[in-house]
């Protein structure tokens, strides 16, 4: 849905959530550009870019939640993701620096689209919660009560280490979105059932 407005049509809203998560699990939209821009696109360095265990809820955990609980967890996790993406963006090279080093400006543009995309998804998560009559959900623009803090990068002066941590975070993010997409794809044609 357009930011700030909510569709009352369950299947259209679910379709939008399915489409957004479908696109967000695609590594070519975020992880791959990040790896190229940060100079990690070398087999030996790529090996170090592994997902940190426990950084995101597992698919098994998500599947054990009812629809409302799932949406609340997703909303909270996306809040963390927004904080972390903002942190990553601060450490990206500037456009002119990219051009000087012969890197693709389109990669930077893809990375800069990540936060607006997450905001759009979060807005639709909020709308779906409204549609399922979930009064506990905080609005996507506000910090939620009990929202976990974003995973804090290890304090380090090592720029390379920070790049690897960003890489690990994005790998986990794509895996998480894949899990979320699989769950949304199982949601049926009717909004009535609270558990799958």
């Amino acid at each position: 849905a357009a930011m700030g407005s909510c569709s009352k049509e369950y299947r259209m809203l679910l379709g939008q959530l399915q489409k957004q998560t479908d696109l967000m699990q695609d590594t070519s939209r975020l992880l791959d550009p990040y790896i190229r821009i940060q100079g990690l696109d070398i087999p030996k360095l790529r090996e170090h870019c592994r997902e940190s265990p426990g950084a995101f809820p597992s698919e098994e955990t998500l599947r054990g939640l009812g629809r409302r609980g799932f949406l609340q967890t997703l909303n909270a996790t996306l809040g963390c993701v927004l904080h972390r993406l903002a942190d990553l963006e601060q450490h990206l090279p500037k456009a002119q620096d990219l051009e000087r080093s012969g890197l693709n400006i389109e990669d930077l543009e893809k990375l800069q689209m990540a936060r607006p995309n997450v905001l759009g998804l979060r807005n639709n998560v909020y709308c779906m919660a409204q549609l399922l009559d979930n009064s506990d959900m905080t609005e996507p623009t506000k910090a939620g009560r009990g929202t976990p803090q974003p995973p804090t990068p290890t304090p380090t002066s090592d720029v390379f280490q920070r790049k690897l941590e960003g890489c690990s975070f994005l790998r986990g993010y794509h895996r998480f979105m894949h899990s979320v997409g699989r769950i949304f794809s199982k949601w049926g044609e009717s909004p009535n059932r609270s558990r799958r």
Epitope: A1, A2, M3, S5, S7, K8, E9, R11, M12, L14, G15, Q16, Q18, K19, Q20, D22, L23, G120, F184, S185, G188, E189, S190
Partner: antibody, heavy 120, light 106 residues
């Protein structure tokens, strides 16, 4: 190869109903939604409605009172019926396939089209 | 409902020329979809999710945009690209189409 072939009358009397059958091949109606769109010189392309893989339907509010979409999965057929046609319902009517099993409201393959003229 | 306004309504281009047409929404939309229609044929999906080429579509086609402003570009016009192009959104109910841009070959 995915195909949607349409059959239906070319001429409909005013106030009568229009029935079109969309017969699909290359995919199963249990896996994909089928939408209906019409195209007229005056109003351009208009989305009319959809029947999803599980059989539920969504209709454009402007046509809801006179539109019905049903299907027979075993015969790979979708049935479109619109009542009380008037001259401004003259258009080409298309069935079109949703691109995957999710609730996607756009169309990756379109039917052959049925040209409908409403006239006495 | 969201109204999509396409411009120009009609345009012509020479073979090899770069072509850009736009689609403007009355409200913000998440993604835009583009279709190509040739006389006597059914519409064909060209671009999905704003910038992804649909299956079998030549790489000279590209899409971009966000919010209320989207565009379709043909990097080098070819004779077979003469057609009418429609944009479509489904961010808001009901799905709606633009009124089309007719592209002719010079």
């Amino acid at each position: 190869q995915v195909q949607l072939k349409q059959s239906g009358p070319g001429l409909v009397q005013p106030s009568q109903s229009l029935s079109i059958t969309c017969t699909v091949s290359g995919f199963s109606l249990t896996n994909y939604g089928v939408h209906w769109v019409r195209q007229s010189p005056g109003k351009g392309l208009e989305w009319l409605g959809v029947i999803w893989r599980g059989g539920s339907t969504d209709y454009n509010a402007a046509f809801m009172s006179r539109l019905s979409i049903t299907k027979d999965n075993s015969r790979s057929q979708v049935f479109f019926k619109m009542n009380s046609l008037q001259a401004d319902d003259t258009a080409i009517y298309y069935c079109a396939k949703s691109p995957n099993s999710n609730f996607y409201w756009y169309f990756d393959v379109w039917g052959t089209g049925t040209t409908v003229t409403v006239s006495s | 409902q969201i109204v999509l306004t396409q411009s120009p309504t009609i345009m012509s281009a020479s073979p090899g020329e770069k072509v850009t047409m736009t689609c403007s929404g009355s409200s913000s939309v998440s993604y835009m979809y583009w279709y190509q229609e040739k006389p006597g044929s059914s519409p064909r999906l060209l671009i999905e999710d704003t910038s992804n080429l649909a299956s079998g579509v030549p790489a000279r086609f590209s899409g971009s945009g966000s919010g209320t402003s989207y565009s379709l570009t043909i990097s080098r016009m070819e004779a077979e690209d003469a057609a009418t192009y429609y944009c479509q959104q489904w961010s808001s109910y009901p799905p709606t189409f633009g009124s089309g841009t007719k592209l002719e070959i010079k």
